[in-house]
Amino acid sequence: MEDEKPKVNPKLYMCVCEGLSCGNEDHCEGQQCFSSLSINDGFHVYQKGCFQVYEQGKMTCKTPPSPGQAVECCQGDWCNRNITAQLPTKGKSFPGTQNFHLE
């Protein structure tokens, strides 16, 4: 069972989905699950979901966390359920920021 790139694992996982891209669904199916945190207009925006395309996940998941965004990825059914991405602040918070879950 191969694609143009035979090294890609065709296995799909069920993931928790939270955020604007999820529509009315609270779950999605993909090759990787993710949990992300970004700062948008002073808000901490948390999102969870799927990468359906291997290259997309590979690129995003290997990006090191920055002060404004962090993504954690995993492979396994519902593996992102209890994952909360953390910004690399070592316990410090940015002034004027609030926690905000996109629903």
């Epitope: 694609d3 296995k11 799909l12 669904e25 199916e29 359906q52 395309v53 291997y54 059914d77 519902w78």
Partner: antibody
């Protein structure tokens, strides 16, 4: 309300290529978020997964059928298609299209394809 | 042949509880979640249970799923005449690299 509808010839001659199309209504394939699969059911028997596709072109097939199967997506028509080459009587079945790659949460009604000369 | 093994038939009277088993191996049920499908006579299959025990919206809570080791079960409590159908289990198989189905169980309401 998302619906799937299969279409294609109900009769295919042995050694020829089976071609079926699944038209998706109520949702855009190109918006992403879902895989699209083909599953078949031999008369009076159980289900057999054929393969899945994503709108960007990624496809994976059942290893037992891989050498004969192609699944393609036409986002402009909001359709995805199944091509099965070198068919024999053993390929006679009801062919279903479905939303999902592993968990099939929406199914087309299915179309019976008979392989006979 | 099917990678997942189900009994060909099961039956019960209205109101009874019926349980359908689905036996697999370490490469499918043992390491992946199980989905169940209901196929009423003359219709397409319908997702009944996903990820071992999750019910899609609209599925009555009379239907429940469970998994233990390399086996899974579908329970129908308070059996009703409209539950007469074929039921299929399915899971990803890591060895075959694909989705495998059980052979199906025909449930008859007596």
């Amino acid at each position: 309300q998302v619906q799937l509808q299969e279409s294609g010839p109900g009769l295919v001659k042995p050694s020829q290529t089976l071609s079926l199309t699944c038209t998706v209504s109520g949702a855009s394939i190109s918006s992403g978020g879902y895989y699209w699969s083909w599953i078949r059911q031999h008369p009076g028997k159980g289900l057999e997964w054929i393969g899945y596709s994503y709108y960007s072109g990624s496809t994976y097939y059942n290893p037992s059928l891989k050498s004969r199967v192609t699944i393609s997506v036409d986002t402009s028509k909001n359709q995805f298609s199944l091509y099965l080459t070198s068919v024999t009587a053993a390929d006679t079945a009801v062919y279903h299209c479905a939303r999902g790659g592993v968990r099939f949460d929406l199914w087309g009604q299915g179309t019976l394809v008979t392989v006979s000369s | 042949s099917y990678e997942l093994t189900q009994p060909p038939s099961a039956s019960g009277t209205p109101g009874q509880k019926v349980t359908i088993s689905c036996s697999g191996s370490s490469s499918n049920i043992g390491s992946n979640t199980v989905n169940w499908y209901q196929q009423l006579p003359g219709t397409a299959p319908k997702l009944l249970i996903y990820s071992n025990n999750q019910r899609p919206s609209g599925v009555p809570d009379r239907f429940s799923g469970s998994k233990s080791g390399t086996s899974a079960s579908l329970a129908i409590s308070g059996l009703q005449s409209e539950d007469e159908a074929d039921y299929y289990c399915a899971a990803w198989d890591d060895s075959l690299n694909g989705v495998v189905f059980g052979g199906g169980t025909k449930v008859t309401v007596l």
